[in-house]
């Protein structure tokens, strides 16, 4: 058993049918010695008396808010949560496996640049009685500071019969140098509590591996005289690290017909312009990627050929 | 990328081309190592990220773009002395800081070159003959060092009398390649920045 926060405790259970569970001793936070009784949640049934209460925690029915009273007055509370260990592996019931980039990916994180700011998100089908708390650091043995905000509900989607809820959090490394070569990964730890179930999820990454630039901005077309060709130009996104000559991007320019089946023409360039043939009803799209370290491509920025 | 690429004009800066070749070569070598050594811990998540140049060179600090020198987090500079007679830029433009930066890059390359050559000698003794260092990568390191043209003491190749542990050698190869790829990215960024200025 360990303390998650004041008056909230997590009991770790080896979770299998007929398991013996864990013996837990609760102590009433009071100078009083006599006339103390204990109850669980809203029940008025007295579970025991005395300054301490010994319970055998086996199932969720044994978890909850234990309260000690004296003469009708509440003295203190202890909330017991359960953390299930199923065959040596901590349970992951609360969050959905996003399966990207690999199986057992519960937290996904992205950064728009090298400033040390990043966003993480996760999915769940649970709509109520759900709380999250996020902590982060650079490295784990001698951790350096990363500050995270509060997790917020960022999107709701319908997936088949189920509703899916996306939560996200923004974090910022306290003293980040965009040019630094990372040798210790960022660690992100999410505590999730659903009703009386506690789970924790972690992700470990280098900022360089989660970079995904914003799409190029100011995408423009300039027809070339007496030609079907156009000059496409664009700019680095505002959110990208500067100077751009050091944090350079490479670009992919795509000409896509109206039909998805039509052949796509693609050109790769390090410049912020390219000359392409503009077909009728086609659109031109440009996306960006770090020129030197191949992390994710940005989303496409698009303009119609007409 | 096997699709058409609109290549930029080779700039005034002769090292840019070499540094791009270096990054390509080390990335290819790392990919080959990860595929060949699939049963070894060779992915970024599995290896310890060690920097053999730590406390010996200070490339990131010495080559910091001017725009980032205002960022206090970027200024944990380590005091290191370097030779300052590089030839990558026309000598009139070679400021002291730039020379310091380029000589730091040169020292990095020299250290990695020694490590890679020592390692290759061990890998050649492996009866499994599983993996060797790409000669192209070693050649590209050499070309960039020549382009940088710094006079510096030659570091003798480390020789070991003891029987090599091939498992450890292959893991060390992975660690070295990961670190060298990260340094090659920095070198490429620096060359691009210097070329633009």
């Amino acid at each position: 058993i360990w303390e998650l926060k004041k008056d909230v405790y997590v009991v770790e259970l080896d979770w299998y049918p007929d398991a013996p569970g864990e013996m837990v001793v609760l102590t009433c936070d009071t100078p009083e010695e006599d006339g103390i009784t204990w109850t669980l949640d809203q029940s008025s049934e007295v579970l025991g008396s005395g300054k301490t209460l010994t319970i055998q925690v086996k199932e969720f029915g044994d978890a909850g808010q234990y309260t000690c009273h004296k003469g009708g007055e509440v003295l203190s509370h202890s909330l017991l949560l359960l953390h299930k260990k199923e065959d040596g592996i901590w349970s992951t019931d609360i969050l959905k496996d996003q399966k990207e980039p690999k199986n057992k990916t519960f937290l996904r994180c992205e950064a728009k640049n090298y400033s040390g700011r990043f966003t993480c998100w996760w999915l769940t089908t649970i709509s109520t009685d759900l709380t999250f708390s996020v902590k982060s650091s650079r490295g784990s043995s001698d951790p350096q500071g990363v500050t995270c905000g509060a997790a917020t509900l960022s999107a709701e989607r319908v997936r088949g019969d189920n509703k899916e809820y996306e939560y996200s959090v923004e974090c910022q490394e306290d003293s980040a140098c965009p040019a630094a070569e990372e040798s210790l990964p960022i660690e992100v730890m999410v505590d999730a509590v659903h009703k009386l179930k506690y789970e924790n999820y972690t992700s470990s990454f280098f900022i360089r591996d989660i970079i995904k630039p914003d799409p190029p901005k100011n995408l423009q077309l300039k027809p070339l005289k007496n030609s079907r060709q156009v000059e496409v130009s664009w700019e680095y996104p505002d959110t990208w690290s500067t100077p751009h000559s050091y944090f350079s991007l490479t670009f992919c320019v795509q000409v896509q017909g109206k039909s998805k089946r039509e052949k796509k023409d693609r050109v790769f360039t390090d410049k912020t312009s390219a000359t392409v043939i503009c077909r009728k009803n086609a659109s031109i799209s440009v996306r960006a990627q770090d020129r030197y370290y191949s992390s994710s491509w940005s989303e496409w920025a698009s303009v119609p050929c007409s | 990328r096997n699709l058409p690429v609109a290549t930029p004009d080779p700039g005034m800066f002769p090292c840019l081309h070499h540094s791009q070749n270096l990054l390509r070569a080390v990335s290819n070598m790392l990919q080959k190592a990860r595929q060949t050594l699939e049963f070894y811990p060779c992915t970024s998540e599995e290896i310890d990220h060690e920097d053999i140049t730590k406390d010996k060179t200070s490339t990131v600090e010495a080559c910091l773009p001017l725009e980032l020198t205002k960022n206090e987090s970027c200024l944990n500079s380590r005091e290191t002395s370097f030779i300052t007679n590089g030839s990558c830029l026309a000598s009139r433009k070679t400021s002291f800081m730039m020379a310091l930066c380029l000589s730091s890059i040169y020292e990095d390359l020299k250290m990695y070159q020694v490590e890679f050559k020592t390692m290759n000698a061990k890998l050649l003794m492996d009866p499994k003959r599983q993996i060797f260092l790409d000669q192209n990568m070693l050649a590209v390191i050499d070309e960039l060092m020549q382009a940088l043209n710094f006079n510096s003491e030659t570091v003798p190749q480390k020789s070991s009398l003891e029987e090599p542990d091939f498992y450890k050698t292959k893991i060390k190869l992975c660690i070295l390649l990961h670190a060298f790829r990260i340094r090659a990215v920095t070198i490429d960024r620096v060359m691009s920045y210097l070329n633009a200025s």
Epitope: D14, P17, E59, D87, I89, D93, N103 | F39
Partner: antibody
């Protein structure tokens, strides 16, 4: 006392269907994940499928994906395996088992796929 | 499709020490716990070892398990005639959990 009692096995022709049941007693069935494991005659153990305690997630071996469906009825304390498009290679003793460090197995039920 | 490899058979005379190996990889045994089962002919498997080296109550202490790196082993010290059975190791793969990964199985013969 934890008990898993299996039923539903038998002889079936290739291409036909069969449904296996596993009745649980002696524990809070709705709190635990459940597996199906099979063993072809003279062969080793092969995992078939898993279902979470609340039925929200199901996982299948590649060899049965798209043909077998694992399900549970927590109100009846029963686990099921619906097997469709059966093949000769599905012939095996099928076991249900609880998920956890200490597990309980059903007695097994024989499924024979033969024309 | 078996990722955990066991020797097909091992044998020993009564009282001898018999060991069965179970060889896996970094993504299974390397980062998950191992169980061992005993299966007598015509019966369901019985749990002998869980959590690499833990014995459930009721299992004789002549059975012991261990794990090192990407391999595990089951030892029977002072093998007895009633130990003649098939033995299976089981673990998980970090990418496919909760799918059970079983070993190929080992037939123990008591001579």
């Amino acid at each position: 006392q934890v008990q898993l009692v299996q039923s539903g096995g038998g002889v079936v022709q290739p291409g036909r269907s069969l449904r296996l049941s596993c009745a649980a007693s002696g524990f809070t069935f709705s709190s635990y994940g459940m597996h199906w494991v099979r063993q072809a005659p003279g062969k080793g153990l092969e995992w078939v499928a898993f279902i979470r305690y609340d039925g929200s997630n199901k996982y299948y071996a590649d060899s049965v994906k798209g043909r077998f469906t694992i399900s549970r009825d927590n109100s009846k304390n029963t686990l099921y395996l619906q097997m469709k498009s059966l093949r000769a290679e599905d012939t095996a003793v099928y076991y249900c088992k609880t998920h956890g460090s200490h597990d309980n197995w059903g007695q097994g039920t024989m499924v024979t796929v033969s024309s | 499709s078996y990722v955990l490899t066991q020797p097909p058979s091992v044998s020993g005379t009564p009282g001898q020490r018999v060991t069965i190996s179970c060889s896996g990889g970094r993504s299974n045994i390397g980062c998950n716990t191992v169980k061992w089962y005993q299966q007598l002919p015509g019966t369901a498997p019985k749990l002998l070892i869980y959590g690499n080296d833990q014995r459930p109550s009721g299992v004789p202490d002549r059975f012991s398990g261990s794990k090192s790196g990407t391999s595990a082993s089951l030892a029977i010290t002072g093998v007895q005639a009633e130990d003649e059975a098939d033995y299976y190791c089981q673990s998980y793969d970090r990418g496919t959990h909760p799918a059970l990964l079983f070993g190929t199985g080992t037939k123990v013969t008591v001579l």
